[in-house]
């Protein structure tokens, strides 16, 4: 997260880190005791999932292995559409005040809605600085019409844009797959953005979760 702030401790109990060994690979969101939602471009053969801590690499955090993941069948590495994936944990999480599932959306929030994005991604760009603490940024949803002025044909119908006019605050490497939460519901998953990160008036681009609720529910049901 560029130009963000340290999240209030325990305020994001659904936030997970997908680790490759001990190294941050992507963010993710707990949606069920067995399931983590993340970006399809974060796919690996297996994952070490850290839950229940705002500190990356926290020894006291829950760490659960995951060996199965299900990309959206329509994910395209060419157009980056349908950048969403479910990761099935090998064992259920122990729910607590520090570990909770996020609320999936009942509807799509409109442009102008205030939201918070979080992650352990680099706080500087192009040189990388990975924080140990979970970082947050407060952003507002931007209309597709406005966002298309910046990204033109790269912006797909199920992509959501967010940012703050003239501000550098945004997502970056390592934040991918992490949550954009608006009015206590998951509205977006970090998908992509301009590099170097933090260029004013280049919004962050997210997978619009409200358009995928049926797929999420059906996939979890199929692979119970």
């Amino acid at each position: 997260i560029i130009d963000g702030y340290k999240c209030k401790e325990g305020s994001h109990p659904w936030q997970v880190a997908l680790l490759k060994g001990n190294q941050l690979h992507c963010g993710g969101v707990l949606v069920d005791k067995y399931w983590v939602l993340t970006a399809a471009h974060c796919k690996m053969g297996q994952y070490q999932v850290q839950l229940g801590s705002d500190k990356i690499g926290d020894q006291s955090a829950q760490k659960i292995k995951a060996t199965k993941s299900f990309r959206h069948p329509g994910y395209s590495t060419k157009t980056h559409v349908n950048d969403i994936m479910l990761v099935r944990l090998d064992e259920p999480v122990k729910m607590s005040s520090k570990v909770e599932a996020v609320q999936l959306p009942e509807h799509c929030e409109p442009p102008g809605t205030s939201c918070t994005v979080s992650g352990w991604g680099t706080t500087t760009s192009p040189d990388v600085t990975f924080p140990s603490d979970l970082m947050c940024s407060d952003v507002k949803l931007i209309s597709s019409r406005e966002c298309k002025k910046v990204y033109k044909d790269l912006l797909g119908k199920t992509m959501l844009c967010a940012g703050i006019p003239d501000s550098k605050t945004n997502t970056c490497n390592g934040d991918s797959g992490g949550p954009l939460v608006c009015n206590d519901t998951l509205q977006g998953l970090v998908s992509w953005g301009t590099y170097p990160c933090g260029q004013p008036n280049d919004p962050g681009v997210y997978t619009q979760v409200c358009k995928y609720k049926r797929w999420v529910m059906e996939t979890m049901k199929t692979h119970r």
């Epitope: 471009h41 980056h80 950048d83 192009p126 490497n173 998908s191 992509w192 953005g193 301009t194 590099y195």
Partner: antibody, heavy 128, light 108 residues
């Protein structure tokens, strides 16, 4: 200041495998922001992209060479390597390693990068 | 694959001249074009990326323009150090990165 240096044999026999290594100094290859690529230039000719690799090991190859190319990365040594099998005289060229600077991060990153830092190049001749 | 066609292949000019090199893509590449300068026996050096963004440390006499399929590299006032071969490269497609055939700028 980032520097790249190619190394490997200058002479390779036809049908054998060409192996080159690029050593990166002045910066870490494991920065998740960048791609690391190989480009070649036959004598008196233009530039041809061979392929690239990300710090995590995701590879992208030129389809015309894909069946013969392997690019790998060794983050512990701050190096990445090229292997080109079944070489012929047509593979004689100056081989450059280079860093790919992305225009986007995340899902869109690997299609939009340009080579911003290059090695000096190493000449490889394929001859018996 | 996207083909990149540069013109002219050779250009004779004098110090102080305004020089223009054109690069055409076989299909639209938006603004995903870079320009490189290469001197004999040396590696290419990045001049311009994203069609018109000047790489850090490159003199302001170099400029790039264009989008879609037609692009231009302009040297506003040619200096002795500018005699070299120039290549364009497209990096905005799902096919491989491809370079133009090069334009050699030589002394008139």
């Amino acid at each position: 200041q980032l520097q790249l240096q190619e190394s490997g044999p200058g002479l390779v026999k036809p049908s054998e495998t060409l192996s080159l290594t690029c050593t990166v100094s002045g910066g870490s290859i494991s920065s998740s922001s960048y791609y690391w690529g190989w480009i070649r230039q036959p004598p008196g000719k233009g530039l041809e992209w061979i392929g690239s690799i990300s710090y995590s090991g995701s590879t992208y190859y030129n389809p015309s060479l894909k069946s013969r190319v392997t690019i790998s990365v060794d983050t512990s040594k701050n190096q990445f390597s090229l292997k080109l099998s079944s070489v012929t005289a047509a593979d004689t060229a100056v081989y450059y390693c280079a860093r790919g600077a992305p225009t986007y991060f995340g899902a869109a990153s690997h299609y939009y990068y340009y080579m911003d830092v290059w090695g000096k190049g190493t000449t490889v001749t394929v001859s018996s | 694959d996207i083909q990149m066609t540069q013109s002219p292949s050779t250009l004779s000019a004098s110090v102080g001249d305004r020089v223009t090199i054109t690069c055409r893509a076989s299909q639209s590449i938006s603004s995903w074009l870079a320009w490189y300068q290469q001197k004999p026996g040396k590696a290419p050096k990045l001049l311009i990326y994203k069609a018109s963004s000047l790489e850090s440390g490159v003199p302001s006499r170099f400029s790039g323009s264009g989008s879609g399929t037609e692009f231009t590299l302009t040297i506003s006032s040619l200096q002795p150090d500018d005699f070299a071969t120039y290549y364009c490269e497209q990096y905005g497609s799902y096919s491989p990165l491809t370079f133009g055939g090069g334009t050699k700028v030589e002394i008139k």
